[in-house]
Amino acid sequence: IVGGHEVTPHSRPYMASVSFEGHHYCGGFLIHTHWVVSAAHCFSDRDPSMGLVVLGAHALLAPEPTQQTFSIAAAVSHPDFQPATQANDICLLRLNGSAVLGPAVRLLRLPRRNAKPPAAGTRCHVSGWGFVSDFEEPPPGLMEVEVRILDLSVCNSSWQGQLNPAMLCTHSGDRRRRGFCSADSGGPLVCGRRAHGLVSFSGLWCGDPKTPDVYTQVSAFVTWIWDVVRASSSPGSTGRSVRAV
């Protein structure tokens, strides 16, 4: 996250960190006790079974008692994910256990299925453990920045026509650099307490106003998300699972 600030620890309890070989790699967010949403491109060249998902974290390198760590039992990328264009850049991670909900671990609500994205100018927040500058500086803890929704046609023009309708864009609202950076991928764009966007890609420089930040528009995938979650719930399974609605 560039141009942002460190959040109050555990004030974004839905945040998940996906790590490989002990290093944070991508973000994600908890929507169900067994499921985290992340970006499909995070797993294009990584074996999901080698990854770990950490919930309840603030400073990832600190051994916080609130942290819950899971391996990835299954990673379900959207069947129409296109690495060449990053279209349909969304992935569901099934945890190998059930998250224990509490003050530091909570679910994030999804938008209504096929809901219109927030109007241009709407203030939203994106958070993550990604770099805080183009120098690839790691953050001291979970970071967040306020951004504004940008009209998709304006954004598509800035991106030389590369976007599709299931994407969402934000900008700083001024000329300053504010937005996400490398390793924020998969994290949520929260508008009105719902995950309307999922961090997908940005331009040459983090927060560059000329190439606005691009997100997967979550509302376009809500049906798919719950279809996957439902399909994986075995009829004979016991124990209560909770989902955000």
């Epitope: 491109h41 060449a84 183009d134 890609f201 331009g203 040459l204 420089w205 983090c206 560059d208």
Partner: antibody, heavy 119, light 107 residues
């Protein structure tokens, strides 16, 4: 040792096409953005195009937009520049360059390949 | 696009001289400026990034300074191998743009 080696340059008539290649070694291709920068004879440097580390995103200079296409094959550690509808003003040495950090600067450059557009 | 204007376009200097090249951006680019050295028939080489950070392996006689719109590359004591053309480049906003170059020649 980091190396970038361009190939594919040559003489082409106006309106023709060429495909340049940039073979990378000594670094993780998928961890760094790749750029093409050109230099017309006796002139300065002009940035042409960029492809993101994932290969999923691209951006072009206005002067080549719609005519040039940058792509990458991460399995081959190679980037490409497909140049169509070539014009005389595209005559230049074309360099591929690797990003330092998150595109802060270009820290490694290839030796360049000359593209001449002439009838 | 942001214009980067270098001055002078060329200069003559002797070995041991202190040489200063300036670069002015058409708008604020913070400290997102790099400097390159290029010799005839060769690819550019990175000297300085983020206005003042010396790139690995570059001799300490090279230094950079500035922020906002005005930037400077200084060679504290010119060496025979330093005769070349120098370019500044902004990496603040898309597209990246270069200065027109400053040719440093032997007096």
């Amino acid at each position: 040792e980091v190396q970038l080696v361009e190939s594919g340059g040559g003489l082409v008539q106006p309106g023709g096409s060429l495909r340049l290649s940039c073979a990378a070694s000594g670094f993780t291709f998928s961890g760094s953005g790749i750029h093409w920068v050109r230099q017309a004879p006796g002139k300065g440097l002009e940035w042409v195009a960029w492809i993101s580390p994932t290969g999923g995103n691209t951006y072009y200079a206005d002067s080549v937009k719609g005519r040039f296409t940058i792509s990458a094959d991460t399995s081959k550690n190679t980037a490409y520049l497909q140049m169509n509808s070539l014009r005389a003003e595209d005559t230049a040495v074309y360099y591929c360059a690797k990003s330092l950090f998150h595109n802060v600067a270009f820290d490694y450059w290839g030796q360049g390949t000359l593209v001449t557009v002439s009838s | 696009d942001i214009q980067m204007t270098q001055s002078p376009s060329s200069l003559s200097a002797s070995v041991g001289d202190r040489v200063t090249i300036t670069c002015r951006a058409s708008q604020d680019v913070s400290t997102a400026v790099a400097w390159y050295q290029q010799k005839p028939g060769k690819a550019p080489k990175l000297l300085i990034y983020s206005a003042s950070f010396l790139y690995s392996g570059v001799p300490s006689r090279f230094s950079g300074s500035g922020s906002g719109t005005d930037f400077t590359l200084t060679i504290s004591s010119l060496q025979p191998e330093d005769f070349a053309t120098y370019y500044c480049q902004q990496s603040y906003t898309t597209p990246p743009t270069f200065g027109q170059g400053t040719k440093v020649e032997i007096k």
